[in-house]
């Protein structure tokens, strides 16, 4: 903490300007009025203060606003934001997307810090849901943001926000997250026709159940192997050879290269060898002819 000392004569700051960089820490504390600092925060960023000097400025704002800074100040924090702790940020009430953007800009190019995570959490909670504009902003700064949310948090994402999601934003999502996002994508894109719909829904199909994959197989979609390999194994297993052939279209030949990997490997084990042979790809490992196949899916579903 900086000691309380009187401001030397003639050094009282009339405005926030470059002359202040020559002030010692104790002079800043004594000579800069906190209310003046608050009204001229937008100037701080343009002045090359040292980290120690920024600590003093933060201390002055903390004293002026013990319950948390007003948004008019927060929006112009600039590099002073990097000095904030998550505890400081939890006191804030950030409602403007412009404020959020301004602060994310300060942290641009870095990993998401605890401060940024807290800021985003406060912002989203304040809004009540993760709307499209917010998601647009967050994924622009942090492409993996969506996949950092829990399934419970993702449940509050409105379908319209899904329009802002790019395929790369889903790269690190696990199946539980896609289970939540896929139904929302279905809702969001339901007014689109077949071919357009498939282009949009493709990235979310890792959360699709068997019924939807069967329905897609009737649409001549020609799913590529990369997408097929990301499907849920339990959703792929019940598909017939004919359905997989329709689903993949000309890409069905790619199954041979993937026959040792899930979900293809597990799917092959569930098919009759006779049926696999109709593909003419040399896929091996199916149920031999003459064997009785018991459908245990009913039991699995009930257990």
């Amino acid at each position: 903490e900086v000691e309380k000392t009187a401001c030397p004569s003639g050094k009282k700051a009339r405005e926030i300007d470059e002359s202040l960089i020559f002030y010692k820490k104790w002079e800043l504390e004594a000579c800069v009025d906190a209310a003046l600092l608050a009204t001229q925060m937008d100037r701080v960023n343009a002045i090359p203060f040292t980290y120690e000097q920024l600590d003093v400025l933060k201390h002055k704002l903390d004293e002026l606003y013990p319950q948390g800074y007003p948004e008019s100040v927060i929006q112009h924090l600039g590099y002073l934001f990097l000095k904030m702790s998550p505890e400081d940020i939890r006191k804030w009430n950030v409602t403007s997307l412009e404020t959020l953007k301004a602060l994310l800009e300060v942290n641009k190019g870095h990993e998401m810090s605890p401060q940024v995570a807290t800021l985003i959490d406060r912002f989203v909670k304040g809004r009540g849901q993760l709307d499209k504009d917010t998601l647009d902003t967050l994924t622009a700064f942090y492409p993996g943001y969506l996949c950092s949310l829990s399934p419970e948090e993702l449940s509050s994402v409105p379908p319209s926000s899904i329009w802002a999601v790019r395929p790369q934003d889903l790269d690190t999502c696990d199946p539980r997250q896609l289970d939540v996002l896929y139904p929302k994508a279905r809702l969001a894109f339901q007014n689109m026709n077949g071919s357009e719909y498939f282009v949009k829904i493709q990235s979310f199909l890792g959360g699709a159940p068997t019924e939807d994959l069967k329905a897609l197989s009737q649409q001549n979609v020609s799913m590529d192997l990369a997408t097929f390999m990301k499907l849920r194994t339990d959703a792929v297993l019940p598909l017939t050879v004919a359905e997989v052939q329709k689903l993949l279209g000309p890409h069905v030949e790619g199954l041979k290269a993937e026959e040792r990997h899930r979900p293809v490997r597990d799917w092959i084990l569930r098919q009759r060898q006779d049926d696999l042979d109709t593909l003419g790809l040399g896929l091996q490992g199916g149920i031999p002819n003459g064997y009785l196949v018991l459908d245990l899916s009913m039991q699995e579903a009930l257990s």
């Epitope: 993702l154 449940s155 139904p183 339901q190 689109m192 719909y197 829904i201 019924e211 329905a215 649409q219």
Partner: antibody, heavy 122, light 106 residues
């Protein structure tokens, strides 16, 4: 034949909560998307939200956000809709409606419950 | 918020054609559904995705949708078709129902 059977009529005081159930009978092995729609006396239909087959994903109409919760008990093929902080204007018949038709972008309300009248009165 | 406007009532003689309109901004860009509701009963889906009929719905029910208007047409209207009819679309995070049209068979 597939049927959706809803819980009985309820009378609630303002500020209270109500939980309406909707049980599928018939083809209970398969699970489907379930909508909830309400209809105030003499008024039109109003969509409240939807829950997906596994119950992990819900989408609520903005108007009910924060007041409505939809859940699903897959073991009993029952879906629940809870509405909190009730006010007199929530007096309505509440319907569950299941999406039975297939189609990747299909959400038609194919099978409807008989409706549950919820009366909010002090 | 998105609004769908329907005429409050439509009257038709038995055997004639009843047309119910549903108006909304750029409605033709969305898929429209239609629901029939008889007094004291739950609604029934009669048309989905503009012009498709669920199984069990008579062929006399048909639909179209373009521009700002979706239309439900009941050709050869029967007394049993007397009911309220609601159009419905998905728009920005919600399903929107039309104001409803009471069809009276004279």
């Amino acid at each position: 034949e597939v049927q959706l059977v809803q819980s009985g009529a309820e009378v609630k005081k303002p500020g209270a909560s109500v939980k309406v159930s909707c049980k599928a009978s018939g083809d209970t092995f398969k699970r489907y998307y379930m909508h909830w729609v309400r209809q105030a006396p003499g008024q039109g239909l109003e969509w409240m939200g939807i829950i997906n087959p596994s119950g992990v994903s819900t989408t609520y109409a903005q108007k009910f956000q924060g007041r409505v919760t939809m859940t699903r008990d897959t073991s009993t093929s029952t879906v629940y809709m809870e509405l909190s902080s009730l006010r007199s204007e929530d007096t309505a018949v509440y319907y569950c409606a299941e999406v039975r038709g297939s189609g990747f972008n299909y959400f038609g309300m194919d099978v409807w419950g008989q409706g549950t009248l919820v009366t909010v009165s002090s | 918020s998105y609004e769908l406007t329907q005429p409050p009532s439509v009257s038709v003689s038995p055997g004639q054609t009843a047309s119910i309109t549903c108006s909304g901004d750029k409605l033709g860009d969305k898929y429209a559904s239609w629901y029939q509701q008889k007094p004291g009963q739950s609604p029934v889906l009669v048309i989905y995705q503009d012009n498709r009929r669920p199984s069990g719905i008579p062929e006399r029910f048909s639909g179209s949708n373009s521009g700002n208007t979706a239309t439900l047409t009941i050709s050869g209207t029967q007394a049993m078709d007397e009911a309220d009819y609601y159009c419905q679309v998905w728009d920005s995070d919600t399903y929107v129902f039309g104001t409803g049209t009471k069809v009276t068979v004279l």
